[in-house]
C-alpha cells in the first residue's frame, strides 16, 4: 500500500523520494511563482497511507520584496492567464551589495483602460520612473538598467477590463560586467559565465522560431561602462519560410501569442530527394474562418494532403515525396483568438516507400502476414507457442499512413489456469484468486443436490502447453427422489413406456384402441417430492359410439375388473 503520486503544481514541480510510508514529496515553483502550502509532504502509515498535508499550489503573488535578487522573474497574478480587477501590486527588487539590476520585458499586455505599469529607479513609490506604460507606447527592447541596487515595480488595474498582465526578468550584475542576456523562445551560449568585458554570447532560437532584430553574436564592451555592443535579438514565429532541415517545427505566426487577422503564410519544407515527410500536427486550434492546407509537393498546385479549419486533436500526415507546402490563411474579419491559439507542426524526414516497416519475430511465437508485401491494408497476426499467451494486440494492420495500428505484442508464459467457472447449485472454495499452478478449486453442492464428478480441481503445469485443471468442473444434480409406481394401461388402451417404476420427473403416455377416445390426460408426470407422485389420475378409453361400446362389453364378460392404481410412490 502506498500514497498516491502527488499532483504536480501548475507552474511548478514535485520530486518524490518514495510513495511508501516515510517517503517525502518536495515542491518548488517556477521563477516568478510562490508556493502556497507545505513545501514538504510526508507519507503517513495507515490502512490506506496518505500525505500529511494537501498538495501546495504555485501562485503569482501580487507584489513582494525580493532581496538578494540575482536572476529571476516577476509575473502578475494569474499569469499567463488574465489578472483580476482592482489590483495594486508593488514589487521591490534588491540586488546583492555592490551590484545593479537589469530588467527584460518578457511580456507586457495591459487592458487599454486605466491599467498601468510603472518601474521606478529606486526602492520606493517616490523614486523616479524609468518606465511608465501611460507614457510609452513601445517597450524598450534593450530593457532597463538601474543606477543603484533597486527597482520598484508597480502594477495597478482598474475595475474594468483585464489582460495577461506582465512578466519581467531581472538579472543582477557586478561592477565591470554586463548583465545576463535573455532571449524569449531561444537560448544562448556564453564564453564566460559572469559576463565580464570581452565576453561573447551567441544566440539561437527554439525550433520553429526565427531570429529577428539585433545580432546573433553580441560582445560585452567598454571597461568604463560595460554594455553589450548590440541589441539582443528576438525569436519569433514568422509567417512563411523555406526549411531544408531533416526535422523541425512549423508554428503559427507569433506562437504562442495569437496570430494576426488576414494573414496568408506559406512554408516550404524540403528533405532529401529519396525521402518523404511525416507531419505530426500536435496543436491545431484555429478559427472556423481560418484555413490550414497541406500540399503534397513544392507548390500550391500539388495534390492537397489535407485542409483544416477550426480546432482538431493530434493527428499525422505523410507526404508521398520529399517536399511539402503548408499554407495558412487567417480570416481578415473575425477577431483573433487568445494565448496558445494557432498550430504546432513537427516534421520528420522518413524513408520513402509504400510499405509499413518490417515487423520482427517475437520470442516464443510466430507471425503470419495476410500477404507478402506489407502494403496499406496488410494484416499481420501474431500467435504464441503452446504454454504462452499474447500480451497486447495479436493483430496489427498497416495503416494508410504506413504505420502499424498497434505496438508489437509479446508472448508471455502462461502460469495459471483459466477460471473453471461456477457450478449451478453449489459454492466453491478457491485457494488463490488468479488460479496459479498448484491452486485448487473445491465445489460443494447446496443441500438437496448431489455432486457428479470431481469435488476438487487442481491447476497442473504441463511441459508443453498451458497449465490445465486436473478434471472438468463437476455438476450438482437434484438428489435422487423415490420413483412412482407404474400405472396399468387403461381398458382398450395402452401406455408407454411399460415399466413397473418410473423415476421422478419421468412422463408416461396413454393411447386408446381404434374406436375409443381418451377421457383424461394423455400424458402424466411423476412429480418429484417426498414422496414422489403422479401429476394426474390415469385416463380411461371410452367407446366412440354406443355400438362400439356394446361390442366391447361382449368381449369383456369374463374379464376381472382392473385393479385400482396407486397414485403414491413406493416408500
Amino acid at each position: 500500500l502506498s500514497c498516491h503520486f502527488p499532483r504536480r503544481p501548475a507552474y511548478g514541480d514535485v520530486t518524490v523520494t518514495s510513495l511508501h510510508p516515510g517517503g517525502s514529496a518536495r515542491f518548488h515553483c517556477a521563477t516568478g511563482y510562490q508556493l502556497k502550502g507545505a513545501r514538504h509532504l510526508t507519507c503517513l502509515n495507515a490502512t490506506q497511507p496518505f500525505w500529511d498535508s494537501k498538495e501546495p499550489v504555485c501562485i503569482a503573488a501580487c507584489g513582494g520584496v525580493i532581496r538578494n535578487a540575482t536572476t529571476g522573474r516577476i509575473v502578475s497574478p494569474g499569469f499567463p492567464g488574465n489578472y483580476s480587477n482592482n489590483l495594486t501590486c508593488h514589487w521591490l527588487l534588491e540586488a546583492p551589495e555592490g551590484q545593479r539590476l537589469h530588467l527584460h520585458f518578457e511580456k507586457v499586455s495591459l487592458a487599454e483602460d486605466d491599467d498601468r505599469l510603472i518601474i521606478r529607479n529606486g526602492d520606493n513609490v517616490e523614486a523616479p520612473p524609468v518606465y511608465d506604460s501611460y507614457e510609452v507606447e513601445y517597450l524598450p527592447i534593450e530593457g532597463l538598467l538601474s543606477s543603484g541596487k533597486h527597482f520598484f515595480v508597480e502594477l495597478s488595474t482598474d475595475s474594468s477590463g483585464a489582460a495577461a498582465g506582465m512578466a519581467l526578468r531581472y538579472e543582477a550584475f557586478q561592477q565591470g560586467h554586463c548583465y545576463e542576456p535573455f532571449v524569449k523562445y531561444g537560448n544562448f551560449s556564453s564564453s564566460t559565465p559572469t559576463y565580464p568585458v570581452g565576453t561573447t554570447v551567441e544566440f539561437s532560437c527554439d525550433p520553429g522560431y526565427t531570429l529577428e532584430q539585433g545580432s546573433i553574436i553580441i560582445e560585452c564592451v567598454d571597461p568604463h561602462d560595460p554594455q553589450w555592443n548590440e541589441t539582443e535579438p528576438a525569436c519569433r514565429a514568422v509567417c512563411s519560410g523555406e526549411i531544408t532541415d531533416s526535422a523541425g517545427v512549423v508554428l503559427s505566426p507569433n506562437w504562442p501569442e495569437p496570430y494576426g487577422r488576414g494573414q496568408d503564410c506559406i512554408w516550404g519544407v524540403h528533405v532529401e530527394e529519396d525521402k518523404r515527410i511525416m507531419l505530426d500536427i500536435r496543436v491545431l486550434r484555429i478559427g472556423p474562418g481560418d484555413v490550414l492546407t497541406f500540399y503534397d509537393g513544392d507548390d500550391l498546385t500539388a495534390r492537397v494532403l489535407g485542409q483544416y479549419s477550426g480546432p482538431r486533436s493530434h493527428f499525422k500526415l505523410f507526404t508521398s515525396m520529399a517536399d511539402v507546402t503548408i499554407q495558412f490563411q487567417s480570416d481578415p474579419g473575425t477577431s483573433v483568438l487568445g494565448y496558445q491559439q494557432g498550430f504546432v507542426i513537427h516534421f520528420f524526414e522518413v524513408p520513402r516507400n509504400d510499405t509499413c516497416p518490417e515487423l520482427p519475430e517475437i520470442p516464443n511465437g510466430w507471425k503470419s502476414p495476410s500477404q507478402p508485401e506489407l502494403v496499406h491494408g496488410t494484416v499481420v497476426t501474431y500467435q504464441c507457442y503452446p504454454g504462452y499467451q499474447v500480451v497486447g494486440s495479436s493483430v496489427l494492420m498497416c495503416q494508410w499512413d504506413l504505420t502499424w495500428s498497434e505496438d508489437l505484442p509479446s508472448c508471455q508464459r502462461v502460469t495459471s489456469c483459466h477460471d473453471p467457472g461456477d457450478v449451478e447449485h453449489s459454492r466453491r472454495l478457491i485457494s488463490s484468486p488468479k488460479f496459479p499452478v498448484g491452486a485448487t478449486v473445491q465445489y460443494i453442492c447446496d443441500q438437496g443436490f448431489v455432486l457428479m464428478g470431481s469435488s476438487i480441481l487442481t491447476c497442473h503445469d504441463r511441459q508443453a502447453g498451458s497449465p490445465k485443471w486436473s478434471d472438468r468442473a463437476p455438476k450438482c444434480l437434484l438428489e435422487q427422489l423415490k420413483p412412482c409406481h407404474g400405472l396399468s394401461a387403461p381398458e382398450n388402451g395402452a401406455r408407454s413406456p411399460e415399466k413397473q417404476l418410473h423415476p421422478a420427473g419421468a412422463t408416461i403416455h396413454f393411447s386408446c384402441a381404434p374406436g375409443y377416445v381418451l377421457k383424461g390426460q394423455a400424458s402424466i408426470k411423476c412429480v418429484p417430492g417426498h414422496p414422489s407422485h403422479w401429476s394426474d389420475p390415469p385416463p380411461i378409453c371410452r367407446a366412440a359410439s354406443l355400438d362400439g361400446f356394446y361390442n366391447s362389453r361382449s368381449l369383456d364378460v369374463a374379464k376381472a375388473p382392473a385393479a385400482s392404481s396407486t397414485l403414491d410412490a413406493a416408500h
Epitope: R427, S431, Q447, G448
Partner: antibody
C-alpha cells in the same frame, strides 16, 4: 470436547482494520471447515464465508467479499478473520462456527467476539 | 438469495402448553435447520435436516415441513425452553437465517 475459543472484544476507529482469531481444540482442525457468522440487531445472523483449513480454499458471501479475509494457521489450529475499512455498520458480534463437507448447518460455535466501531 | 421469514417474532407460553413456530422460505428448500440462542450466549444447533434432534435436545422438541414451509414444535413448554430460535437453510448459497422467534415463559 469440541471447543472454539475466540479473541476478546475490540473497540476500533472508523477506517481501521481488525483481525479476530478462533482457536479450535478437541477435534482434527483440518477435517472441518471454519465458517464465520455476523450477528447484529438490524440483520439477525449473516453468513460471511468459510475456509477449508486443509487447502486454504475460501468462499465468501458476495456482501462480505470486499470486507472480510479468512485465513488459517494449521500449526496452531487457529482461524482468523480480518475486517477492513471499518464503519459503524460493522459493529456486531462475530462468531466462528465449525462445519463439514456434508454438514449444511453450523454444529459448534465460538463464544463470539464483540466489535465496536466508534470514533 | 433465499429469504427466511419467521413467525411470530415474539410469543409467550405457559409451562405445559404446546408451542409451534413457523419458518417460511421465499422459494422451495430441501431441508431446514434450527438453532436455539439464549441471551448473552452463542447459538446452539438444535434441530438439523428438518426433523433430527441435536444431541442433548429434549424429545419434546420436533421439526417438520417441506417445500417453503417448515415448523418447530414443543409438545409441552418448560421454563428452560425460553430462548430465541433461528431457522437456517443451505439449499441455495449463500446460507441464510430467519430473523428469529423469541419464546418467553408466562
Amino acid at each position: 470436547e469440541v471447543q472454539l475459543q475466540q479473541s476478546g472484544p475490540e473497540l476500533v476507529k472508523p477506517g481501521a482494520s481488525v483481525k479476530i482469531s478462533c482457536k479450535a481444540s478437541g477435534y482434527s482442525f483440518t477435517d472441518y471447515y471454519m465458517r464465520w457468522v455476523k450477528q447484529s440487531p438490524e440483520k439477525s445472523l449473516e453468513w460471511i464465508g468459510e475456509i477449508n483449513p486443509s487447502t486454504g480454499g475460501t468462499t465468501y458471501n458476495q456482501n462480505f467479499k470486499a470486507k472480510a479475509t479468512l485465513t488459517v494457521d494449521k500449526s496452531s489450529s487457529t482461524a482468523y478473520m480480518q475486517l477492513k475499512s471499518l464503519t459503524s455498520e460493522d459493529s456486531a458480534v462475530y462468531y466462528c462456527a465449525r462445519g463439514g463437507y456434508f454438514l449444511y448447518y453450523f454444529d459448534y460455535w465460538g463464544q463470539g467476539t464483540t466489535l465496536t466501531v466508534s470514533s | 438469495q433465499i429469504v427466511l421469514t419467521q413467525s411470530p417474532a415474539i410469543m409467550s407460553a405457559s409451562p405445559g402448553e404446546k408451542v409451534s413456530m413457523t419458518c417460511s422460505a421465499s422459494s422451495s428448500v430441501s431441508y431446514m435447520h434450527w438453532y436455539q440462542q439464549k441471551s448473552g450466549t452463542s447459538p446452539k444447533r438444535w434441530i438439523y435436516d428438518t426433523s433430527k434432534l441435536a444431541s442433548g435436545v429434549p424429545a419434546r422438541f420436533s421439526g417438520s415441513g417441506s417445500g417453503s414451509s417448515y415448523s418447530l414444535t414443543i409438545s409441552s413448554m418448560e421454563a428452560e425452553d425460553a430462548a430465541t430460535y433461528y431457522c437456517q437453510q443451505w439449499s441455495s448459497t449463500p446460507p441464510t437465517f430467519g430473523g428469529g422467534t423469541k419464546l418467553e415463559i408466562k
